[in-house]
Interface confidence: low
Amino acid sequence: EVEKTACPSGKKAPEIDESLIFYKKWELEACVDAALLATQMDRVNAIPFTYEQLDVLKHKLDELYPQGYPESVIQHLGYLFLKMSPEDIRKWNVTSLETLKALLEVNKGHEMSPQVATLIDRFVKGRGQLDKDTLDTLTAFYPGYLCSLSPEELSSVPPSSIWAVRPQDLDTCDPRQLDVLYPKARLAFQNMNGSEYFVKIQSFLGGAPTEDLKALSQQNVSMDLATFMKLRTDAVLPLTVAEVQKLLGPHVEGLKAEERHRPVRDWILRQRQDDLDTLGLGLQG
């Protein structure tokens, strides 16, 4: 902590400007009014302060707002955000998407830090749910964000938000997460016609039950093998050979290449050899 010293004569800062980069740490502490700093936070980012100087500015804001910064200050923190601890951020009440975007921009290109994770958590909890605009923003900055959430957290995603999800956002999701997301996707996309519906629902099918796979098999969807391999084993096992053939369409030949991998291996073992032979792929049960 910087020792309290009186501001030298003529050094009192009338505004936040570049002249402050020549101030020593103790001078910043003594000569910059915290309330002035709070109202002119947007200028801090344009001034090349050292990390040590930023520490002083943060300290001044902490003293002014011991219960947590107001959003008007948070939105303009810029690089000062990198100085915040998760404990600091837990005191904040961030409700504006613009504030969230501004702070995520500061961390852009880096892995999600504990600070960012805490910020997102505070923001989402403040909103009460992970709405479409928020999800759009978060997945743009962190494509793996959705799959970093627990199934319990995902349950707060309303179906309308699913429209913001891109296939790559689900790449690292495990089956438990897809179990939560799939029903929401079904509801979100339900009024689309068959072919459009399949394009949208495809990435979520790792959470689909057997009944829905059976239904899809009646709709000429031609599921690719990559999607088929991500289906739940317990959902695939009850499918008949005819249903899998209809589901995969021309991609059915790919089963041969995957016959030793789940869920194909387990599915083959459940089928009658006579039925497998109708595929003409030499699959052995």
Partner: antibody, heavy 121, light 107 residues
Framework: EVHLQQSGPELVKPGASVRIPCKAS????????MDWVKQSHGKSLEWIGD????????IYTQKFKGKATLTVDKSSSTAYMELRSLTSEDTAVYYC??????????????WGQGTTLTVSS | DIQMTQSPASLSAYVGETVTITCRAS??????LAWYQQKQGKSPQLLVY???TLADGVPSRFSGSGSGTQYSLKINSLQPEDFGSYYC?????????FGGGTKLEIK
């Protein structure tokens, strides 16, 4: 606890319109479709249509196109069915019912208590 | 639209008996079928969904079975509270029709 609260009995004149509310509580309103079902006295159940409260998308049976209009008010978690150009044929009990799970899963797991509509001059 | 034909239209049975109600669809409905019970003057209650899954709180004496176009609801060891009307409903195509109903009466 999930609850669907419908309004009391309605007596309306032929040619008039009526709007029946169904207030949902105990769950996230936008996460489940709401279906509407008609039951004439001593008869079977008749599916009218459904609405997706999240985006307002509706599906109606052919018979009820032009007769029924389904809407929702998300702010009050209330679904509505408006019936227009009423005749004695529309005299029945009308139920709202929540669709089990999501689109494609088969079942209406919670039902309102029903609104009795009587069309008579 | 797919039509649902339910039989029998009415049925009398003793307490303790086993009864079966059937529903035939005019096309393959791929297990997208529900069964409901309705008591006089009350709302229907879901018993079975996806053809064979018991809804929460439904006693195990109820069971659903079938596939393709033929489905049935079986009630083992009938209890006094089981009497009422039963309906099937399909959810396969866009328009989800109900069967005509079966009235189960006490002998």
């Amino acid at each position: 606890e999930v609850h669907l609260q419908q309004s009391g009995p309605e007596l309306v004149k032929p040619g008039a319109s009526v709007r029946i509310p169904c207030k949902a509580s105990g769950y996230t309103f936008t996460d489940y479709n709401m279906d509407w079902v008609k039951q004439s006295h001593g008869k079977s159940l008749e599916w009218i249509g459904d609405i997706n409260p999240d985006n307002g998308g509706t599906i109606y049976t052919q018979k009820f196109k032009g007769k029924a209009t389904l809407t929702v008010d998300k702010s009050s978690s209330t679904a509505y069915m408006e019936l227009r150009s009423l005749t004695s044929e529309d005299t029945a009990v009308y139920y709202c019912a929540r669709r089990l799970h999501y689109y494609g899963s088969s079942g209406l797991d919670y039902w309102g208590q029903g609104t009795t509509l009587t069309v008579s001059s | 639209d797919i039509q649902m034909t339910q039989s029998p239209a009415s049925l009398s049975a003793y307490v303790g008996e086993t009864v079966t109600i059937t529903c035939r669809a005019s096309g393959n409905i791929h297990n997208y079928l529900a069964w409901y019970q309705q008591k006089q003057g009350k709302s229907p209650q879901l018993l079975v969904y996806n053809a064979k899954t018991l809804a929460d709180g439904v006693p195990s004496r109820f069971s659903g079975s079938g596939s393709g176009t033929q489905y049935s609801l079986k009630i083992n060891s009938l209890q006094p509270e089981d009497f009422g009307s039963y309906y099937c409903q399909h959810f396969w195509s866009t328009v989800w029709t109900f069967g005509g109903g079966t009235k189960l009466e006490i002998k």
